[in-house]
């Protein structure tokens, strides 16, 4: 019979990429039912061969976390899903071309707020990716990202705010009123590659000055 | 204390090859952004490359792209410069620095790299 | 490349001077104020006085302070001392490849 149009089996195949870790997401088409299953395959951008994902062979979920498959960062990746109906009908999509250094998005960062009496520090902890170094190690964001900041504001009132920022982990906010409530926010921004996390907020008091009473 | 010693300059003719090594000590080598920057005689400064010691990330000024060839021995804790079809306007002074706690703060007393016939 | 503009190129000055020296980003280097001072003299490889374009580093006298944002940056210092005689570099650590400027020498008149 005439091919269908695989849209009606399959649709938005895709990588959902945060901190490194490479997730491939689709939706079912108007055609697809809950017992239409998914298999999914994935190759380095230059190779001939498809390399079938084991865990993610006539699944019935639609998401397959592909993370170590695309964990270099030098390389490019396509993915693709086949989706086989229970009639016996049989669709397949492919990704885009996928770069986790390009198309990650940055998580807000781990970040410890400290009260002091007349300011407040903050330190920020470096971000572990699931991506492994020649040692074992995890790396971190600043291990990717030579050019990775942290951007840090304090709201101080309705109309003021200050700001730090730099490659540094620890910040520190200076001149501050004792015993008063203040909100930080702290972003991490990769500029070289248009990349900026949503914020890390902290709701923190500074501490009441004791020396007066 | 942070020390970093840079060795294996000298004289070298156009179009031969050169390797730089520069010690390090006293910060933990194996989690760092590590730097070569040359002078040029009564020349400004130049960052040449980068590498990070953990995941082996690379950058390189275009000027030397294709020719040098930035590496580590982290069991030695010891930066490399591999620097091939070397040109005249590659003399210069070569230090190595790093960065710790987000600042480039520390860098070595360099070598001198001079290409000439 | 981002393009560093420093001026002046160098500076005859009496000890007690104060002194400005000014550096000029060919593009923003962003709200972080990305921007480093360094020290050198004869011989000797660099000394970072100033970090985040105003942030004096750990030990550095205070007669040296740093202002400017966005493109445009100033070091100054407040009362020339015989140690200060050296050639000051602005560096733009925002992107890569990090830039200096070309360098401004500061000597006795």
């Known amino acids: 019979h005439a091919p269908e149009d695989p849209s009606d089996l399959l649709q938005h195949v895709k990588f959902q990429s945060s901190n490194f870790e490479n997730i491939l997401t689709w939706d079912s088409g108007p055609e697809g039912t809950p017992d239409t299953v998914y298999s999914i395959e994935y190759k380095t951008y230059g190779e001939r061969d498809w390399v079938a994902k084991k865990g993610c062979q006539r699944i019935t979920r639609k998401s397959c976390n592909l993370t170590v498959e695309t964990g270099n960062l030098t390389e490019l990746y396509y993915a693709r899903v086949t989706a086989v109906s229970a009639g016996g009908r049989s669709a397949t999509k492919m990704t885009d071309r996928f770069s986790s250094l390009q198309h990650t998005t940055l998580k807000p960062p781990d970040v410890t707020c400290i009260s002091k009496v007349r300011s407040i520090q903050m330190i920020v902890h470096p971000t572990p990716t699931p991506i492994r170094a020649g040692d074992g190690h995890r790396l971190t964001l600043e291990d990717i990202f030579h050019d990775l900041f942290y951007h840090l504001e304090l709201q101080v009132n309705r109309t003021y705010q200050m700001h730090l920022g730099g490659k540094q982990r620890e910040y520190e906010f200076f001149g501050l009123t004792p015993d008063t409530e203040f909100l930080g926010t702290i972003m991490i921004c990769v500029p070289t590659w248009a990349k900026e996390s949503a914020p890390y907020m902290c709701r923190v008091k500074t501490l009441p000055d004791r020396t007066w009473t | 204390e942070v020390q970093l010693v840079e060795s294996g300059g000298g004289l070298v003719q156009p179009g031969g090859s050169l390797r730089l090594s520069c010690a390090a000590s006293?910060?933990?080598?194996?989690?760092?952004?590590m730097y070569w920057v040359r002078q040029a005689p009564g020349k400004g400064l130049e960052f040449v490359s980068v590498?990070?010691?953990?995941?082996?990330?690379?950058h390189y000024v275009e000027s030397v792209k294709g020719r040098f060839t930035i590496s580590t021995d982290n069991a030695k804790n010891t930066l490399f410069l591999q620097m091939n079809s070397l040109k005249s306007e590659d003399t210069a002074v070569y230090y190595c620095?790093?960065?710790?706690?987000?600042?480039?703060?520390?860098w070595g007393q360099g070598t001198q790299v001079t290409v000439s016939s | 490349d981002i393009v560093m503009t420093q001026s002046p190129s160098s500076l005859s000055v009496s000890l007690g001077d104060r002194v400005t020296i000014t550096c000029q980003a060919s593009?923003?280097?962003?709200?972080?104020?990305?921007l480093a001072w360094y020290q050198q003299k004869p011989g000797q490889s660099l000394k970072l006085l100033i970090h985040g374009a105003s942030r004096l580093q750990t030990g550095v006298p205070s007669r040296f302070s740093g202002s400017g944002s966005g493109t445009s940056f100033t070091l100054a210092i407040s009362g020339v001392e015989a140690e200060d005689l050296a050639t000051y570099y602005c560096l733009q650590d925002y992107a890569w490849p990090l830039t200096f400027g070309q360098g401004t020498k500061v000597e006795l008149k």
């Open positions: 593009q923003s280097i962003g709200s972080v104020n990305a």
């Open positions: 590498i990070n010691t953990r995941s082996g990330i690379t």
């Open positions: 620095a790093t960065r710790i706690q987000g600042l480039i703060d520390y």
């Open positions: 006293g910060f933990t080598f194996s989690s760092s952004w």
